[in-house]
C-alpha cells in the first residue's frame, strides 16, 4: 500500500512539475525590466526565451519573437535546449510511468517489469528536473551578470544633456516558476525511485541446505546470487529441487530487495 | 462619432478647489483611459493625470498632492478635482482619450474648458 | 523628468513647399523592443490639439499623408512635403516613454 501510494504521489508531483517546466519555457517573463530608478515607466519591457515583449501603462501588450536562430546569445539557446531536453525526457517519463503505475492493470505485465518502468521514469524525472533546474540556473547567472555590467555602463552614454539610460533586466516570474517546477520533478523523480524499490520481487539468493536422506547426504547448492538488473528471464524464482525442507528466505513470497537502485 | 465634452466652473477664487467633469460618447471607459493635459494662456501643454479603463492611475508627480481622479463608467463621466489653486493654474483643461488595444496615444481631445483663478 | 526641446519657435513657409520640424529629448525615446515613444500633436488656431503621429513615424487615423516622421532616439523630425493653408497652428512633440509625458514648447508653422 505504501509502495503504492509513493509511486501515485511521484506520479502527481512529477505531472505537476513537468507541467510547470512547459509553463515556465512558454512564459514571456524570463526577465522583466528593473523598475528601481523608475517605478513609474509608461512602457514595461519583459523577455522571454521565445520572444520579448513590451507591456504600455494603457494595458496595450506588443510582443515580438526572436526571429533569428544565429543572432541570439549562445547561452539562450543552451537555456532552451536544457528546458526542450527537460520537457521531452519529462513527457517520455510520464508516458512510462504511467504504465508502471500498480494501480493501473495492463494485460499480464509482471511486478518486476513495472519495477523496472518505475526506476526508467523516475530517473527520467530527476534528469528533466535537473534540466530545468539548470536551464534556469543559466538564464539567471546571465541575467545577474548582465544586471550588473548595465549598471556600471548606466550613464556611460552621457554626451551633454543627452541620457541614454540602458534598460536594466532583473529575474522574472518565469524562472522562479522553473525552480519550483524542476524541484518537483526532481523530488517526483526521486519518489519513483524510492517506490520502484518495494514493487518487485527479487530473485532470491537460497542458502545453502542439507537434506539428510537415508543412506547418503547430499548438499544442493542453487547458482550463485545473480546480480538482477530486473530484466532477467528467471522472475520467478522456480525451485530446481524441493525436498521438503525451507529456508527463511522461502517463507516470504516477494522479498523487498533491490540492489540496483 | 468619438466626443470628449469638459464641464465645471469658469472662474474659481485662489486656495478654493476645482471640479471638472468630462464626459463621453462614442465609445466606453471599460476599453479607454482618459488623461487630463492642461495648457496655460499662450503656453505649451502639461500633463496632470490618467485614469486607466481598469480603474489604476498615474499621476504627474509635481502636482500628485493637489490632484483626485475617479470615473463613472456607466455614466460615461471623468472627475477631476484640483486643490489649493493658485493664479497660475489659470488654463484651458483638456480631457483626452487614450485606447486600451492600440499603440495609439491621446488619439482625441475635448474642446477644453477654460478655468480662470482669479479673486 | 524627460525635458522636450523644439528649438524653433516659429517657422514661415510658402504653401506647397516641403518644411522640418525638429524636437530632440534629454533622454532616449528608443526603447528595447525598437519602438521609440515620441508623438507629435497639431493645435490649429482656436482648436484643441489633434494626434498626427505616434511612435515617432506612424501616422494616426485621419492624418494626411503629407506628413512623415523619422529620427534617431533623441532627436525627431517631422517633415510637411507639400504645405497646405490647414496645415498652419503650433505643433508639439511628446514624450511617452515615462512619466510624467511631457511636450516641446511648440513650433508656430506660419504661412508666408
Known amino acids: 500500500m505504501a509502495v503504492t501510494a509513493c509511486q501515485g504521489l511521484g506520479f502527481v508531483v512529477s505531472l505537476i512539475g513537468i507541467a510547470g517546466i512547459i509553463a515556465a519555457t512558454c512564459m514571456d517573463q524570463w526577465s522583466t525590466q528593473d523598475l528601481y530608478n523608475n517605478p513609474v515607466t509608461a512602457v514595461f519591457n519583459y523577455q522571454g526565451l521565445w520572444r520579448s515583449c513590451v507591456r504600455e501603462s494603457s494595458g496595450f501588450t506588443e510582443c515580438r519573437g526572436y526571429f533569428t536562430l544565429l543572432g541570439l546569445p549562445a547561452m539562450l539557446q543552451a537555456v532552451r535546449a536544457l528546458m526542450i531536453v527537460g520537457i521531452v525526457l519529462g513527457a517520455i517519463g510520464l508516458l512510462v510511468s504511467i504504465f508502471a503505475l500498480k494501480c493501473i492493470r495492463i494485460g499480464s505485465m509482471e511486478d518486476s517489469a513495472k519495477a523496472n518502468m518505475t526506476l526508467t521514469s523516475g530517473i527520467m524525472f530527476i534528469v528533466s528536473g535537473l534540466c530545468a533546474i539548470a536551464g534556469v540556473s543559466v538564464f539567471a547567472n546571465m541575467l545577474v551578470t548582465n544586471f550588473w555590467m548595465s549598471t556600471a555602463n548606466m550613464y556611460t552614454g552621457m554626451g551633454g544633456m543627452v541620457q541614454t539610460v540602458q534598460t536594466r533586466y532583473t529575474f522574472g516570474a518565469a524562472l522562479f516558476v522553473g525552480w519550483v517546477a524542476g524541484g518537483l520533478t526532481l523530488i517526483g523523480g526521486v519518489m519513483m525511485c524510492i517506490a520502484c524499490r518495494g514493487l518487485a520481487p527479487e530473485e532470491t539468493n537460497y542458502k545453502a541446505v542439507s537434506y539428510h536422506a537415508s543412506g547418503h547426504s547430499v548438499a544442493y547448492k542453487p547458482g550463485g546470487f545473480k546480480a538482477s538488473t530486473g530484466f532477467g528471464s528467471n522472475t520467478k524464482n522456480k525451485k530446481i529441487y524441493d525436498g521438503g525442507a525451507r529456508t527463511e528466505d522461502e517463507v516470504q513470497s516477494y522479498p523487498s530487495k533491490h540492489d540496483y537502485v | 462619432q468619438v466626443q470628449l465634452k469638459e464641464s465645471g466652473p469658469d472662474l474659481v477664487a485662489p486656495s478654493q478647489s476645482l471640479s471638472i467633469t468630462c464626459t463621453v460618447s462614442?465609445?466606453?471607459?471599460?476599453?479607454?483611459?482618459v488623461h487630463w493635459v492642461r495648457q496655460p494662456p499662450g503656453k505649451g501643454l502639461e500633463w496632470l493625470v490618467v485614469?486607466?479603463?481598469?480603474?489604476?492611475?498615474n499621476y504627474n508627480s509635481a502636482l500628485k498632492s493637489r490632484l483626485s481622479i475617479t470615473k463613472d463608467n456607466s455614466k460615461r463621466q471623468v472627475f477631476l478635482k484640483m486643490n489649493s489653486l493658485q493664479i497660475d493654474d489659470t488654463a484651458i483643461y483638456y480631457c483626452?482619450?487614450?485606447?486600451?488595444?492600440?499603440?495609439?496615444?491621446?488619439?482625441?481631445w475635448g474642446q477644453g474648458i477654460s478655468v480662470t483663478v482669479s479673486s | 523628468d524627460i525635458v522636450m526641446t523644439q528649438d524653433a519657435p516659429s517657422i514661415p513657409v510658402t504653401p506647397g513647399e516641403s518644411v522640418s520640424i525638429s524636437c530632440r529629448s534629454s533622454?532616449?525615446?528608443?526603447?528595447?523592443?525598437?519602438?521609440?515613444?515620441l508623438y507629435w500633436f497639431l493645435q490649429r488656431p482656436g482648436q484643441s490639439p489633434h494626434l498626427l503621429l505616434y511612435?515617432?513615424?506612424n501616422p494616426a487615423s485621419g492624418a494626411p499623408d503629407r506628413f512623415s516622421g523619422s529620427g534617431s532616439g533623441t532627436e525627431f523630425t517631422l517633415r510637411i512635403s507639400r504645405v497646405e493653408a490647414e496645415d498652419v497652428g503650433v505643433y508639439y512633440c511628446?514624450?511617452?516613454?515615462?512619466?510624467?509625458?511631457?511636450f516641446g514648447a511648440g513650433t508656430r508653422l506660419e504661412l508666408k
Open positions: 483626452v482619450r487614450h485606447p486600451a488595444f492600440g499603440p495609439h496615444a491621446m488619439d482625441y
Open positions: 462614442g465609445f466606453s471607459l471599460t476599453n479607454y483611459g
Open positions: 485614469i486607466w479603463s481598469d480603474g489604476r492611475i
Open positions: 533622454k532616449s525615446l528608443l526603447n528595447s523592443n525598437g519602438n521609440t515613444y
Open positions: 511612435r515617432m513615424s
Open positions: 511628446m514624450q511617452y516613454l515615462e512619466y510624467p509625458p511631457t
